[in-house]
């Protein structure tokens, strides 16, 4: 529209004006995990906490059993950290046994699932290397970016070891998405 | 507004459309922090560039006092990066004592101070162990979410040591905030 | 214009209103990188995947020569992951040595390139040492920030050593920006 | 006001200890590394080592290792600096030094003279 | 441990002169690179941190450049308070190491 006189019924046609305090948008927060059956050969997804404290849905954005449900179709800004925590990790008990460092590992991979595809798609992926020296060790990894989805699709986060997410506080562990 | 006539004295009354350029937003750049009081029991907090180099505050979002101030009401994506930099870590030589390795560590904390509220709200947190080998260690913590905000709330980054923070260029620390 | 009626013809004189869907934007993905002459004295640049899988680039956003050319002024958000791999430091080998531990280190630059400056600008930096003890290693770095951009700006991702990236998967190195 | 007051002139026999203080003012003592620098009459600047005034974590110059002993007390915003088994060539002006980051010194006391003599 | 060497060891010069002092590490220090100046019976000030940044209250005829291994201090036009004894010192890695000194005399 640059330099173009405002002209609503010529611009509706290809790409309607938004306010932009209705588009979908959430912020999920951590709640402590409960055991429950997982996909097999899939990380195990983590549910969240959607409207208590800082988290909040809007705008026909809906979380439901662990997905956050894309209610419109558009370029969506995705992004997630998942805090870790952990008591020594294997790689320093490998390393004292004298046998090779095969390092422990931490994901956070962020998942569309689309109903028509029969294979969910990974749309973020950290993964790090835990060879810690100390007894006790803790750190985010954090994911963000920006991608087209569809109407329909749903998204989720799936961590490498769901009993190491540090559940303790919402500004910790949090995922969200919201319509560019 | 999908599929629905361009309305806009009906849309005017929950959601006015607004012109991007004309949001609220800031990026703010590290500055060497100067020794000063800190709040008691919380984290020190960080003073920031705002109008230098890539640093900068536009329509209504003002920096002064370590806060950034907000001036709108609405959804607004927040972010920070602090990188750290030490010479050894304590873990180290606690561990050269054979006591057990309680880690060093460092957090970053992006905090929102609302008046009417006694106490400030964490909004998003990272937090990881340090218990490195080598003498010289550095390493970012990056943060970012989106938060609905209320006019007159105000922002700032609070660090668990504020002594380890790099100083050194615009590009490694950062904090910043915009209207979506 | 909070509180104010909606006034096009006054909006339109200071900032037109756009359609969302009609911004520049774009979201790369990792390819192997092929050795390639990189400039003197500074990182080596990455190269992308701009259309294939997960990536695109749309609404003038174009991406030529390892660049992402920058169609209009405006306020951008820029982000990138890179994701490192390594066998052992040459830190844990200093140091069985006895030798003074100099880390090693991972870095990413993301940079600015305006053909009327001389020289680049560094807009985002994200630097680790790395001392790990396992032998295997891999981690990601993550950046993301608001930046002012002119027409014809271009946007690139430096790495400190391009044969420690991370080519297998395009969740897992990324680079993206978007008009706000 | 920022400061530090370090405690005044000390003449020590060779062998014997000495121990310097640093009161802090006008900042948050604990969110700022203290350093101890000493400076030998007409000489350059020597580092000895920092504490960590929040956790009571120390870094001492190898040169010190064994001979120094930083310490703090939080109630008082106090640092202190104790070197044993003094030896001639540690007469000297004993600064405590802080500053906003980790490896530059804003701020420096007055400077303790410590005299080791027979 | 990084050894700093500083030239001049002394130097003469006269008010209203432009002096160089220039400070080389011996391994890259990046740009943790300090600058002070002593006074006869007075504490170090701090100059120029991170080897180009002006410390807060120092007058601007004071600079500083430099990145890696070698840095020079500038100043632009010597005032009488200016004479006194300048001292480079690394914050890159422990210990912190200071260079020689730099003493500046009246011509």
């Known amino acids: 529209l640059k330099g173009q006189e405002f002209a609503p019924s010529h611009q509706q046609v290809y790409a309607p004006l938004r306010a932009d305090g209705d588009k979908p948008r959430a912020h999920l927060t951590v709640v402590r995990q409960t055991p429950t059956q997982h996909f097999k050969n899939q990380f195990p997804a983590l549910h969240w906490e959607h409207e208590l404290g800082l988290a909040f849905t809007k705008n026909r954005m809906n979380y439901t059993n662990k997905f956050l449900l894309i209610p419109e179709s558009g370029d969506y800004f995705i992004y997630s950290q998942v805090t870790f925590r952990g008591m020594t990790s294997e790689c320093s008990e490998i390393r004292q046994a004298g046998r090779p460092n095969k390092p422990d590992s931490i994901t956070v991979v962020i998942t569309k699932v689309t109903d028509s595809y029969p294979e969910p798609t990974q749309l973020l992926m950290g993964t790090k290397s835990v060879c810690e020296v100390g007894s006790n060790w803790f750190q985010p990894i954090y994911l963000g970016a920006m991608f087209s989805l569809q109407e329909g699709d749903k998204l989720m986060v799936n961590v490498s070891d769901i009993s190491l997410v540090d559940y303790t506080k919402e500004d910790k562990t949090f995922f969200g998405a919201f319509l560019l | 507004l999908k599929g629905q006539e361009f309305a806009p004295s009906h849309q005017q009354v929950y959601a006015p459309l607004r012109a991007d350029g004309d949001k609220p937003r800031a990026h703010l750049t590290v500055v060497r922090q100067t020794p000063t009081q800190h709040f008691k029991n919380q984290f020190p907090a960080l003073h920031w560039e705002h109008e230098l180099g890539l640093a900068f505050t536009k329509n209504r979002m003002n920096y002064t006092n370590k806060f950034l101030l907000i001036p709108e009401s609405g959804d607004y994506f927040i972010y920070s990066q602090v990188t750290f930099r030490g010479m050894t870590s304590e873990c180290s030589e606690i561990r050269q004592a054979g006591r057990p390795n309680k880690p060093d560590s460092i957090t970053v904390v992006i905090t929102k101070v609302t008046d009417s509220y006694p106490e400030p709200t964490q909004l998003l947190m990272g937090t990881k162990s340090v218990c490195e080998v080598g003498s010289n260690w550095f390493q970012p913590i990056y943060l970012g979410a989106m938060f609905s905000l209320q006019e007159g709330d105000k922002l700032m980054v609070n660090v668990s040591d504020i002594s380890l923070v790099d100083y050194t260029k615009e590009d490694k620390t950062f904090f910043g905030a915009f209207l979506l | 214009l909070k509180g104010q009626e909606f006034a096009p013809s006054h909006q339109q004189v200071y900032a037109p209103l756009r359609a969302d869907g009609d911004k520049p934007r774009a979201h790369l993905t990792v390819v192997r990188q092929t050795p390639t002459q990189h400039f003197k004295n500074q990182f080596p640049a990455l190269h992308w995947e701009h259309e294939l899988g997960l990536a695109f680039t749309k609404n003038r956003m174009n991406y030529t020569n390892k660049f992402l050319l920058i169609p209009e002024s405006g306020d951008y958000f820029i982000y990138s992951q890179v994701t490192f791999r390594g066998m052992t430091s040459e830190c844990s080998e200093i140091r069985q040595a006895g030798r003074p531990n100099k880390p090693d280190s991972i870095t990413v630059v993301i940079t600015k390139v305006t053909d009327s400056y001389p020289e680049p600008t560094q807009l985002l930096m994200g630097t680790k040492s790395v001392c790990e003890v396992g032998s295997n290693w891999f981690q990601p770095i993550y950046l993301g920030a608001m930046f002012s951009l002119q027409e014809g700006d271009k946007l690139m991702v430096n790495v400190s050593d391009i044969s420690l990236v991370d080519y297998t998967k395009e969740d897992k190195t990324f680079f993206g920006a978007f008009l706000l | 006001e920022v400061q530090l007051v370090e405690s005044g002139a000390e003449v020590k026999k060779p062998g014997a200890s000495v121990k310097v203080s640093c009161k802090a003012s006008g900042y948050t003592f604990t969110a700022y590394y203290m350093h101890w620098v000493r400076q030998a009459p007409g000489q350059g600047l020597e580092w000895m080592g920092w504490?960590?005034?929040?956790?009571?974590?120390?870094n001492y110059a190898q040169k010190f290792q064994g001979r120094v002993t930083m310490t703090r007390d939080t109630s008082i915003n106090t640092a202190y600096m104790e070197l044993s088994r003094l030896r001639s060539d540690d007469t000297a002006v004993y600064y405590c030094?802080?500053?906003?980051?980790?490896?530059?010194?804003?701020?420096w006391g007055q400077g303790t003279m410590v005299t080791v003599s027979s | 441990d990084i050894v700093m060497t500083q030239s001049p060891s002394s130097l003469s010069a006269s008010v209203g002169d432009r002096v160089t002092i220039t400070c080389r590490a011996s391994q890259s220090i990046s740009s943790y690179l300090n600058w002070y100046q002593q006074k006869p019976g007075k504490a170090p000030k701090l100059l120029i941190y991170g080897a180009s940044r002006l410390q807060s209250g120092v007058p601007s005829r004071f600079s500083g450049s430099g990145s890696g291994t070698d840095f020079t201090l500038t100043i632009s036009s010597l005032q009488p308070e200016d004479f006194a004894t300048y001292y480079c010192?690394?914050?890159?890695?422990?210990?912190?190491?200071f260079g020689p000194g730099t003493k500046l005399e009246i011509k």
């Open positions: 504490i960590n005034p929040n956790s009571g974590g120390t």
């Open positions: 030094a802080s500053g906003g980051s980790i490896d530059a010194f804003d701020i």
């Open positions: 010192q690394q914050g890159f890695s422990t210990p912190f190491t």
